[in-house]
Interface confidence: low
């Protein structure tokens, strides 16, 4: 089990680092988006795990961004962000339907309402229970 957990961490960390770089290979990314969405978490250890991902880095004040699956829907009252940015992405996650293309990568400003903790603990609990 310890080996499985280590392997899972390696896969996840690699998935985060390569997030959005290959439009033809999105299965791992979609799976991880779904994990964040369902477990209400963001990143592996912390949301900051996303901050090193080149494709999500902007300039200046927009330098820190995370995928929409990190977004805590219940914590926002900004209907513009919800309607235009978040909900379209989460509807795809909810249905696990269409394959996502690179143009659909949805990043929100990190100063928005995103989940406070990483997914490691929740996934490790899940592994122990199964």
């Amino acid at each position: 089990r310890a080996q499985l957990e280590r392997s899972l961490r390696d896969v996840v960390e690699k998935t985060i680092q390569k997030y959005g770089t290959n439009p033809e290979e999105t299965a791992a990314e979609e799976s991880w988006d779904y994990v964040q969405f369902q477990l209400r978490c963001c990143g592996w250890h912390y949301p900051q795990d996303w901050f090193q991902v080149l494709i999500l880095r902007g300039n200046g004040s927009e330098a820190h961004r995370v995928p929409c699956s990190c977004y805590n829907l219940s914590a926002t009252n900004d209907s513009t962000i919800l309607d235009k940015v978040i909900l379209p992405q989460l509807s795809r996650l909810g249905h696990l339907a269409r394959s996502r293309h690179s143009a659909d990568i949805c990043a929100v400003p990190a100063e928005s309402h995103i989940y406070r903790e990483g997914c490691a603990q929740g996934l490790q609990k899940w592994l122990h229970n199964n």
Partner: antibody, heavy 119, light 110 residues
Framework: EVQLVESGGGLVQPGGSLRLSCAAS????????MNWVRQAPGKGLEWVSI???????DYASWAKGRFTISRDNSKNTLYLQMNSLRAEDTAVYYC?????????????WGQGTLVTVSS | AYDMTQSPSTLSASVGDRVTITCQAS??????LAWYQQKPGKAPKLLIH???TLASGVPSRFKGSGSGTEFTLTISSLQPDDFATYYC????????????FGGGTKVEIK
């Protein structure tokens, strides 16, 4: 009403142990990150530890190994187990709710419980 | 990592004065900063979170600003009830941290 009430403080000898409790009402501990913060007499606030909704924990670097944060969801109570206590651990200890979203602040706070470490 | 430096440590002012307290983070914390007010013998009370968002029930004379590493708490017109100690706290990270709080600023009567 959302409320936190600490208990378990008191006088303890150096090297001794103490367990603090924080009873929560008006909300569920299991859906929130919870913190312990302390304040030595006449000094500033010092963060001690956090337990996240998932159960993962973090500690101030100086608290690792001696202090343990935990919670009992069925009792809606937060705990801080303090071992190998030193005179410099003398302080009022507060529990505070942080919520589950990154950037949430500490609100509300308990009234605090005084821990005195002295021989 | 993420050390918070608050200044000044003590501030003498009169009722009606405009008061400014600064908080500097050793690394970029975006806008994950809160301000608290504490009176002797009482628990701290949240004033501002996310650097500039006023907590419920806090008077509009309190204003928070800043992002990245430099933050400011301003009281536009000091009231008798505002003489207290103020603390900033970073909410960016809890990993390998000595303290998430600044050292505090005591606002006393001149």
């Amino acid at each position: 009403e959302v409320q936190l009430v600490e208990s378990g403080g008191g006088l303890v000898q150096p090297g001794g142990s103490l367990r603090l409790s924080c009873a929560a009402s008006g909300f569920s501990l299991s859906y929130n990150a919870m913190n312990w913060v302390r304040q030595a007499p006449g000094k500033g606030l010092e963060w001690v530890s956090i337990i996240f909704a998932s159960g993962r924990t973090d500690y101030a670097s100086w608290a690792k190994g001696r202090f343990t944060i935990s919670r009992d969801n069925s009792k809606n109570t937060l705990y801080l187990q303090m071992n190998s206590l030193r005179a410099e651990d003398t302080a009022v200890y507060y529990c505070a709710r942080e919520g589950s979203t990154w950037g949430d602040a500490l609100d509300p706070w308990g009234q605090g419980t005084l821990v005195t470490v002295s021989s | 990592a993420y050390d918070m430096t608050q200044s000044p440590s003590t501030l003498s002012a009169s009722v009606g004065d405009r008061v400014t307290i600064t908080c500097q983070a050793s690394q970029n914390i975006i806008d994950y900063l809160a301000w608290y007010q504490q009176k002797p013998g009482k628990a701290p009370k949240l004033l501002i979170h996310k650097a500039s968002t006023l907590a419920s029930g806090v008077p509009s004379r309190f204003k928070g600003s800043g992002s990245g590493t430099e933050f400011t708490l301003t009281i536009s017109s000091l009231q008798p009830d505002d003489f207290a100690t103020y603390y900033c706290q970073q909410g960016y990270s809890n990993s390998n941290i000595d303290n998430t709080f600044g050292g505090g600023t005591k606002v006393e009567i001149k």
